[in-house]
């Protein structure tokens, strides 16, 4: 269960608008992508989860914000710049790039609600778009026209 | 802006629990994955969006539910059973499988809220996990031990 304080504005406010105010401005992730610290992981496993068996393997990085819902989001971080060869599972194939797939996810931030006289009346939820990287995908490089 | 009625339960109820009731039971997508109707798309493009350039290309199918937030979700549908060759961009390589990457996304459903005497008091939001397919990933097939 959520333990956030009540998100009900005071009587007279437009609850639905106050509760879920729409913003189309994507919020950048809290933590910038760091270069991979585990170059030894740049291989495609023959077992394990999908992100390990992929020829564009990735790991997940936790992004936690207690004032956001969901509080925990995970960002994919590619382990290789190119795709891993399907034949060997370890050597890189420069004909393919390992690229991040991004998605603007709907999230909610809590912020103070204000009553009729500007008094603090619990918390309201503000809806935002938040960019997360979902996975790494093996793609053919763009051909520059 | 949202035009849903107020989602505040009656006085005395635990708003945070009532507003955002947590369920860990994933909600299945409304429509099961269907085999691709457009096999001519089973190729990796050298331009266009990531899902077209991937060697495990996919398309997106819209899943709209007016009683859910977000109302629009997109399910990836793989266009090929195997990965496309990095060399040709069209022939399939049976050494790699194109597999769906799934994610349990947090969504919210609106449902009637009930007051102290069981009366209907607007709508509350119920938090649920909803399984979406995010992308298709080229993976090495599992080796059965």
């Amino acid at each position: 269960y959520s333990h956030w304080p009540s998100c009900c504005p005071s009587k007279g406010q437009d609850t639905s608008e106050e509760l879920l105010r729409w913003s189309t401005v994507p919020v950048p992730p809290l933590e910038p992508a760091r270069p991979n610290r585990h170059p030894e992981s740049c291989r495609a496993s023959e077992d394990g989860p999908l992100n390990s068996r992929a020829i564009s393997p990735w790991r997940y990085e936790l992004d936690r914000d207690l004032n956001r819902l969901p509080q925990d989001l995970y960002h994919a971080r590619c382990l290789c710049p190119h795709c891993v060869s399907l034949q060997t599972g370890s050597h890189m194939d420069p004909r393919g790039n390992s690229e991040l797939l991004y998605h603007n996810q709907t999230v909610f931030y809590r912020r103070p609600c204000h009553g009729e006289k500007g008094t603090h009346k619990g918390y309201c939820l503000e809806r935002r778009l938040y960019r997360v990287s979902l996975a790494c995908v093996c793609v053919r490089p763009r051909v520059m026209g | 802006y949202s035009h849903w009625p107020s989602c505040c339960p009656s006085k005395g109820q635990d708003t945070s629990e009532e507003l955002l009731r947590w369920s860990t039971v994933p909600v299945p997508p409304l429509e099961p994955a269907r085999p691709n109707r457009h096999p001519e798309s089973c190729r990796a493009s050298e331009d266009g969006p990531l899902n077209s350039r991937a060697i495990s290309p996919w398309r997106y199918e819209l899943d709209r539910d007016l009683n859910r937030l977000p109302q629009d979700l997109y399910h990836a549908r793989c266009l090929c059973p195997h990965c496309v060759s990095l060399q040709t961009g069209s022939h399939m390589d049976p050494r790699g499988n194109s597999e769906l990457l799934y994610h349990n996304q947090t969504v919210f459903y609106r449902r009637p809220c009930h007051g102290e005497k069981g009366t209907h008091k607007g709508y509350c939001l119920e938090r649920r996990l909803y399984r979406v397919s995010l992308a298709c990933v080229c993976v090495r097939p599992r080796v059965m031990g």
Epitope: S16 | Y1, R64
Partner: antibody
Framework: EVQLVESGAEVKKPGASVKVSCKAS????????MNWVRQAPGQRLEWMGL????????SYNQNFKGRVTLTVDTSASTAYLELNSLRSEDTGVYYC???????????????WGQGTLVTVS | DIQMTQSPSSLSASVGDRVTITCSAS??????LNWYQQKPGKVPKLLIY???SLHSGVPSRFSGSGSGTDFTLTISSLQPEDVATYYC?????????FGQGTKLEIK
């Protein structure tokens, strides 16, 4: 000013395919889904499907049994409808229509193209 | 698919009359209903969305009401320029479906 301009009339033989284009201007093309609606002579409007230009996401009317393909070229702000295995009952006017929405209550086709007459005979 | 049925299929009324068109859904669609107007030889135009909200530029003589399965489009005082076919459309679920249309003429 929002405008949707469709390609010209087409005459096709049964079994052939047709591709209709819809060029959008006056708004952010990727910000709105595009619907396609058919009107056969003297018949009601029939929804064929929609596409979100932002990610190419589609929803099709299964009554067309997979004969419809919707695509977009975002660089040209153009949506396309392709209908294959044409039959005489596919004769009609084909409209593209932008879908407006708010966060919760409505999805409505607020701007329509001028229509493309497709004749199958 | 959700079936939409309009009545009457056609009607004739005099200028200044109050005109009512009804639309019935085969299952409950809450308020997820739009109305469109199509004048002879022209493109359909959005008239009313979400059962009762008037689209911008639409004269206030048009109004909509209803909920669940039964909906009404009302023209409070018919004008000559209102000659058209009117369609209801549900958007609760895909595929979107339209009524068969109501053809409105002036007596």
């Amino acid at each position: 000013e929002v405008q949707l301009v469709e390609s010209g009339a087409e005459v096709k033989k049964p079994g052939a395919s047709v591709k209709v284009s819809c060029k959008a201007s006056g708004y952010s093309f990727s910000g709105y889904t595009m619907n396609w609606v058919r009107q056969a002579p003297g018949q009601r409007l029939e929804w064929m499907g929609l596409i979100n230009p932002y990610n190419g996401g589609t929803s099709y009317n299964q009554n067309f049994k997979g004969r419809v393909t919707l695509t977009v070229d975002t660089s040209a702000s153009t949506a396309y409808l392709e209908l294959n295995s044409l039959r005489s009952e596919d004769t009609g006017v084909y409209y593209c229509a932008r879908e407006d929405y708010d966060s919760w209550t409505f999805f409505a086709m607020d701007y329509w193209g001028q229509g493309t007459l497709v004749t199958v005979s | 698919d959700i079936q939409m049925t309009q009545s009457p299929s056609s009607l004739s009324a005099s200028v200044g009359d109050r005109v009512t068109i009804t639309c019935s859904a085969s299952q409950g669609i809450s308020n997820y209903l739009n109305w469109y107007q199509q004048k002879p030889g022209k493109v359909p135009k959005l008239l009313i969305y979400y059962t009762s909200s008037l689209h911008s530029g639409v004269p206030s003589r048009f109004s909509g009401s209803g909920s669940g399965t039964d909906f009404t489009l009302t023209i409070s005082s018919l004008q000559p320029e209102d000659v058209a076919t009117y369609y209801c459309q549900q958007y609760l679920a895909f595929p979107y479906t339209f009524g068969q249309g109501t053809k409105l003429e002036i007596k």
